[in-house]
């Protein structure tokens, strides 16, 4: 059994989240994950889900009684989702930590927007980029 | 030329964000995107980047002078990143809008954690999970 299972059960008790009534009014994540079979689509959704859990865990980082459980789960997420790749995890964390209200961050984001957009569609990497993108001058 | 280019230039002017070169170590997103070539890795990162822009645009939704630019860019993001798939976009938006401080959301998230974790690694869908992952102890 993966280590996260026991620790997640521990968290369920802590949050009083074991009862079936918690599942009332639909799911948060599971229903959405069911909709997407294609790996890249799943990554789009899972990226948001993982960042949600990281934020949630951060809110409870000072709570001694669940610290070990949280750390174990985060570590297992690191193995499963980031394939134990520290650089991948660090880049992800960096992205999740940018403050949308920071004026410098806003201006940088706007500055980079055109280049970010040019890379958004899968075709952008394969050399099949539209001529208009190749001609763009920032 | 893609419609977003002109509108992004308009936003640059509005933010007075200039045309100076952005050094690699000074970028928010471009340096990170450069690190990842694998499509699923890119989607993990781009998912965070796109949600950042959506949040940023939400902050400026009442600003008449850039409304058209913002709407055009969002629409182009929809085409490029979500492949014009409304369901994909809606599921994504749903995930980004969950409040991490809402107690009911917290309980649901913890309730679903075990199943979410089980689906995180690509192999989880194919039944070919690595033995090392099965043995991993956090």
């Amino acid at each position: 059994q993966d280590p996260y299972v026991k620790e997640a059960e521990n968290l369920k008790k802590y949050f009083n989240a074991g009862h079936s009534d918690v599942a009332d009014n639909g799911t948060l994540f599971l229903g959405i994950l069911k909709n997407w079979k294609e790996e890249s689509d799943r990554k789009i959704m899972q990226s948001q889900i993982v960042s949600f859990y990281f934020k949630l865990f951060k809110n409870f980082k000072d709570d001694q009684s669940i610290q070990k459980s949280v750390e174990t789960i985060k570590e297992d997420m690191n193995v499963k989702f980031f394939n134990s790749n520290k650089k991948k995890r660090d880049d992800f964390e960096k992205l999740t930590n940018y403050s949308v209200t920071d004026l410098n961050v806003q201006r940088k984001a706007i500055h980079e927007l055109i280049q970010v957009m040019a890379e958004l569609s899968p075709a952008a990497k394969t050399g099949k980029r539209k001529r208009s993108q190749m001609l763009f001058r920032g | 030329q893609d419609p977003y280019v002109k509108e992004a230039e308009n936003l640059k002017k509005y933010f007075n964000a200039g045309h100076s070169d952005v050094a690699d170590n000074g970028t928010l997103f471009l340096g990170i995107l450069k690190n990842w070539k694998e499509e699923s890795d890119r989607k993990i990162m781009q998912s965070q980047i796109v949600s950042f822009y959506f949040k940023l645009f939400k902050n400026f939704k009442d600003d008449q002078s850039i409304q058209k630019s913002v709407e055009t860019i969002k629409e182009d993001m929809n085409v490029k990143f979500f492949n014009s798939n409304k369901k994909k976009r809606d599921d994504f938006e749903k995930l980004t809008n969950y409040s991490v401080t809402d107690l009911n959301v917290q309980r649901k998230a913890i309730h679903e954690l075990i199943q979410v974790m089980a689906e995180l690694s690509p192999a989880a869908k194919t039944g070919k999970r690595k033995r090392s992952q099965m043995l991993f102890r956090g």
Partner: antibody
Framework: QVQLVQSGSELKKPGASVKISCKAS????????MNWVKQAPGQGLKWMGW????????TYVDDFKGRFVFSLDTSVSAAYLQISSLKAEDTATYFC??????????WGQGTTVTVSS | DIVLTQSPATMSASPGERVTLTCSAS?????MFWYHQRPGQSPRLLIY???NLASGVPARFSGSGSGTSYSLTISRMEPEDFATYFC?????????FGQGTKLEIK
Amino acid sequence: QVQLVQSGSELKKPGASVKISCKASGYTFTDYGMNWVKQAPGQGLKWMGWINTYTGESTYVDDFKGRFVFSLDTSVSAAYLQISSLKAEDTATYFCARRGFYAMDYWGQGTTVTVSS
Amino acid sequence: DIVLTQSPATMSASPGERVTLTCSASSSISYMFWYHQRPGQSPRLLIYDTSNLASGVPARFSGSGSGTSYSLTISRMEPEDFATYFCHQSSSYPFTFGQGTKLEIK
């Protein structure tokens, strides 16, 4: 190369007005905002606000609302700071500084305003 | 308003010496900027985005920090480095500067 050239020193009486100019060259004026910074004698730097050179919209710090006005003449790539009803405490050196992509990356040489009766 | 507190207010050092100046912010910020100003001159940008060297600034200058705690280090003081140093934040309105640290020759 980028240059910001400010107008010369001013000696004014209390109650008078002054208008300082900051002429930019070496870049596209409307691509970068312009900050104004005050430095009283022997003191530190105090940000007064900035003007968006594309939209013309000004942002003022609370301490500089009312008697202080930022303006532009984009045809000559110039930004202006006007101070009315001058007081002794307005005696300072005023700098314009380009709101560069990262920070206040280029500064004018400063204009000293002395308010004395 | 975010208050930036620099320490020390004045510091004496010798040429060739390693010097570290600190700047503490009253709230967390994403980036810190550093300027220096020689008497009778306008300020000059040294460091942007906490740790990046501005154009033309010698490599002996470096910046670091995060959250509320930031520092500027000069690895080997040169005669022209004796000046007043200001930290600056433009993460939220109003932009603010530290009160300055004056570096004097010992």
